[in-house]
């Protein structure tokens, strides 16, 4: 039950996180005009990954896309790439995790297959979250650098325009959305990986009986979930004291998660 809850919660948290990453990527407010210590203007500038916008005090908002690829800063391109990779990985992860959910029965899918899919989706969520956090952090660093370097005629905009009035940009709402969303996706991924450890069929516990292998010559299949980290292979010949009562044949008759990696 706890495993199902952990897996379900991991899925939901990751889903929210990925939705947040998509939202952040699409948002226009990655950087916003710094209003502190500046003359009060009747115009408010803000910029996203795909376009820059100007909101006049009249209420009229005008946005212009960056219709060039080569003319854009490499850092901006890198941020775009990181966010897109994060979204793609997250979307694939969501697709995989739907089929991996313990509460959803698809044909005669083995629990071990579900465990592997859960692990795969978990890793995808972790990488997705890291991509988003990295992308947002790179952009934030770019903003901080430009903020302190900005002078009257310095190029700081995304669209390659010369500034005649010093317009300094600070963190926009999208950065915070991105950081939070990336963190949620990461947490969701970790939860999926934790759930994976409890999903494998070896986890069936018969607490009344303890089975011990006789001798040291018996080679066990790697990946006893209580004996290893769950991510690496346990290749040494050793006893697995996991409280599970099973024969050697039983252990070998089930494919472990490492057979799928």
């Amino acid at each position: 039950m706890a495993v199902t809850a952990c897996q379900g919660l991991g899925f939901v948290v990751s889903l929210i996180g990925i939705a947040g990453i998509i939202a952040a990527t699409c948002m226009d407010q990655w950087s916003t005009q710094d209003l502190y210590n500046n003359p009060v203007t009747a115009v408010f500038n803000y910029q996203g990954l795909w376009r820059s916008c100007v909101r006049e005090s009249s209420g009229f908002t005008e946005c212009r896309g960056y219709f060039t690829l080569l003319g854009l800063p490499a850092m901006l391109q890198a941020v775009r790439a990181l966010m897109i990779v994060g979204i793609v990985l997250g979307a694939i992860g969501l697709l995989v995790s739907i089929f991996a959910l313990k509460c959803i029965r698809i044909g005669s899918m083995e629990d071990s297959a579900k465990a592997n899919m859960t692990l795969t989706s978990g890793i995808m969520f972790i990488v997705s979250g890291l991509c988003a956090i990295a992308g947002v952090s790179v952009f934030a660093n770019m903003l901080v650098t430009n903020f302190w370097m900005s002078t009257a005629n310095m190029y700081t905009g995304m669209g390659g325009m010369v500034q005649t009035v010093q317009t300094r940009y600070t963190f926009g709402a999208a950065l915070f959305v991105g950081w939070v969303a990336g963190g949620l996706t990461l947490i969701g991924g970790v939860m999926m990986c934790i759930a994976c450890r409890g999903l494998a069929p070896e986890e069936t516990n018969y607490k009344a009986v303890s089975y011990h292998a006789s001798g040291h010559s018996v080679a066990y299949k790697p990946g006893g979930f209580k004996a290893s980290t769950g991510f690496g292979s346990n290749t040494k010949n050793k006893k697995i004291y996991d409280g599970g009562a099973r024969t050697e044949d039983e252990v070998q008759s089930y494919p472990s998660k490492h057979d799928y990696v």
């Epitope: 003359p39 009060v40 115009v43 820059s52 100007v54 009249s58 905009g157």
Partner: antibody, heavy 117, light 113 residues
Framework: EVQLVESGGGLVQPGGSLRLSCAGS????????MSWVRQAPGKGLEWVSS???????YYLDSVKGRFTISRDNAKNSLYLQMNSLRAEDTAVYYC???????????WGQGTLVTVSS | DIVMTQSPDSLAVSLGERATINCKSS????????????LTWYQQKPGQPPKKLIY???TRESGVPDRFSGSGSGTDFTLTISSLQAEDLAVYYC?????????FGQGTKLEIK
């Protein structure tokens, strides 16, 4: 047809108060940024105050603390509450709508405020 | 505050001739975000409220005759009437629409020579 009609002007003594109103027809004032602009007799135009979305207000330094711009969405009206009036506040007061480029595209006919003892 | 200075204060031009009014701001009115200059030109005839002619320094308001044109960028702007008509006799104002307070120029009175 869009129409802005100012009212509430008149003769007032220095230190007195007046409340100017601007009623809109053919236009929903609450959806636009609105401004008050004044023109002293025989002089040029002078921006006085603006109210933008979210109720954010801006004032000319010389009227800050004395004048208050507001609006009543239900009555589709814009107001300028003028307190501690001075002789230099004597002018025709216009209300106008801000539009593209923050430019004032629709103007009322104006209401005359005379501050004199 | 931004100071808007118009020149000349008054201008006498013959009908059919070109009239040029200049406006200089004490700070650049060019917004880097959209590369637009936040300057507006108004026409005011006696006893009437002002009428918007040009916004964003060079965009003509709908319904304004095409003999009116605006140009300039940054701090220097120009309103040009290519062929003066009798109905163009009025006072012309430029306005800073970028920085608060939204200051006006002192006005240029256009007369017939």
């Amino acid at each position: 047809e869009v129409q802005l009609v100012e009212s509430g002007g008149g003769l007032v003594q220095p230190g007195g108060s007046l409340r100017l109103s601007c009623a809109g027809s053919g236009i929903t004032l609450s959806t636009y940024a609105m401004s008050w602009v004044r023109q002293a007799p025989g002089k040029g135009l002078e921006w006085v105050s603006s109210i933008i979305s979210g109720g954010i207000t801006y004032y000319l330094d010389s009227v800050k603390g004395r004048f208050t711009i507001s609006r009543d969405n239900a009555k589709n009206s814009l107001y300028l509450q003028m307190n501690s009036l001075r002789a230099e506040d004597t002018a025709v007061y216009y209300c106008a709508r801000k539009y593209h480029g923050n430019a004032l595209d629709y103007w009322g006919q104006g209401t005359l405020v005379t501050v004199s003892s | 505050d931004i100071v808007m200075t118009q020149s000349p204060d008054s201008l006498a031009v013959s009908l059919g001739e070109r009239a040029t009014i200049n406006c200089k701001s004490s700070q650049s009115l060019l917004n880097s975000g959209n590369q637009r200059n936040y300057l507006t030109w108004y026409q005011q005839k006696p006893g009437q409220p002002p009428k918007k002619l040009i916004y964003w320094a060079s965009t003509r308001e709908s319904g304004v005759p095409d003999r009116f044109s605006g140009s300039g960028s940054g701090t220097d702007f120009t309103l040009t009437i290519s062929s003066l008509q009798a109905e163009d006799l009025a006072v012309y104002y430029c306005q800073n629409n970028y920085f608060y307070p939204l200051t006006f120029g002192q006005g240029t009175k256009l007369e017939i020579k």
